[in-house]
Interface confidence: low
């Protein structure tokens, strides 16, 4: 079974996202992975996209994230663009219109992205073998 190119794109984007920290990668997001035993793969992707959308919607123009230097500003802008791309690709992979995100647990964005990367790499290894 050939791996979906969208999956490869997601992994590539996650690699870029986890390579460099920004002022706001330590901010918290809803941890949808904390209790996802009864969740389908598509629901997980949809909920992950929802969490990312909530994050970039709230913090795209957050002055704390934009920082005081040109480099901090550029890195945050790049983070938001990658999150948007990730959102779209996850949304396309999920194929669902909406999904609830009700978990109380929190995780840093950095840890959330690392966890998502692990899941995506596992999925890729299965479909490429």
């Amino acid at each position: 079974h050939k791996c979906d190119i969208t999956l490869q794109e997601i992994i590539k984007t996650l690699n870029s996202l986890t390579e460099q920290k920004t002022l706001c990668t330590e901010l918290t997001v809803t941890d949808i992975f904390a209790a996802s035993k009864n969740t389908t793969e598509k629901e997980t992707f949809c909920r992950a996209a929802t969490v990312l959308r909530q994050f970039y919607s709230h913090h795209e123009k957050d002055t704390r994230c934009l920082g005081a230097t040109a480099q901090q500003f550029h890195r945050h802008k790049q983070l938001i663009r990658f999150l948007k791309r990730l959102d779209r690709n996850l949304w396309g992979l999920a194929g669902l219109n909406s999904c609830p995100v009700k978990e109380a647990n929190q995780s840093t964005l950095e840890n959330f992205l690392e966890r998502l990367k692990t899941i995506m790499r596992e999925k890729y290894s299965k479909c490429s073998s």
């Epitope: 794109e9 663009r81 959102d87 690709n89 949304w91 396309g92």
Partner: antibody, heavy 123, light 106 residues
Framework: QLQLQESGPGLVKPSETLSLTCTVS??????????WGWIRQPPGKGLEWIGS???????DYNPSLKSRVTISVDTSKNQFSLKLSSVTAADTAVYYC???????????????WGQGTMVTVSS | DIQMTQSPSSLSASVGDRVTITCQAS??????LNWYQQKPGKAPKLLIY???NLETGVPSRFSGSGSGTDFTFTISSLQPEDIATYYC????????FGGGTKVEIK
């Protein structure tokens, strides 16, 4: 097959807001994994991407136009719209709506285009 | 913002000639590049996506190559119906079109 049709006034006065609508027929505007964009072309010049709206509802705008642009979708009417505020003569162009994302990636090529509508900014 | 520089801006060639257009990105865009054909008074038409993939229904005389910052679009044997302006477009970060190359028949 899927078709796109732009509509709106052909003449807009300077400092006013340009409003265009793109009606999608032959398919649903909510279809995964497509997205929708606006591109313009001033007379005798090249193509300029204005902005796009995605199934998630998120938007991307050309940084040079971002402060003046709003793109929205009305799924009930199978339409998406462009609003460009504070127009000047430099905004005179043929405005195209287009569908994107029709290949293996979500961010992708604009593969279906409307025929374009000429908008002149003049008093 | 990523800038796309297309060259030449115009060219004139004979029917049957091999025509080559280049597009250079201001930074590495992998293969996130498309090529479009626009005939006078018409909307652009997608010819090549992902730098080298031929869109369904497009004649095989059209081809694309390249990765990173340098890309090439080729018409192996120019036909009268190929008279048009050709544009490259990157989608690595937002979307930017090249300035266009107008192709005419000698």
């Amino acid at each position: 097959q899927l078709q796109l049709q732009e509509s709106g006034p052909g003449l807009v006065k300077p400092s006013e807001t340009l409003s265009l609508t793109c009606t999608v027929s032959g398919g649903s505007i909510s279809s995964i994994p497509y997205y929708w964009g606006w591109i313009r072309q001033p007379p005798g010049k090249g193509l300029e991407w204005i902005g796009s709206i995605y199934p998630s509802g998120s938007t991307d705008y050309n940084p040079s136009l971002k402060s003046r642009v709003t793109i929205s979708v009305d799924t009930s009417k199978n339409q998406f719209s462009l609003k460009l505020s504070s127009v000047t003569a430099a905004d005179t162009a043929v405005y195209y709506c287009a569908r994107g994302g029709a290949r293996d990636r979500i961010d992708h090529a604009f593969d279906i285009w409307g025929q374009g509508t000429m908008v002149t900014v003049s008093s | 913002d990523i800038q796309m520089t297309q060259s030449p801006s115009s060219l004139s060639a004979s029917v049957g000639d091999r025509v080559t257009i280049t597009c250079q990105a201001s930074q590495d865009i992998s293969n996130y590049l498309n090529w479009y054909q626009q005939k006078p008074g018409k909307a652009p038409k997608l010819l090549i996506y992902d730098a080298s993939n031929l869109e369904t229904g497009v004649p095989s005389r059209f081809s694309g190559s390249g990765s990173g910052t340098d890309f090439t679009f080729t018409i192996s044997s120019l036909q009268p119906e190929d008279i048009a302006t050709y544009y490259c477009q990157q989608y690595y970060d937002l979307y930017t079109f090249g300035g266009g190359t107008k192709v005419e028949i000698k």
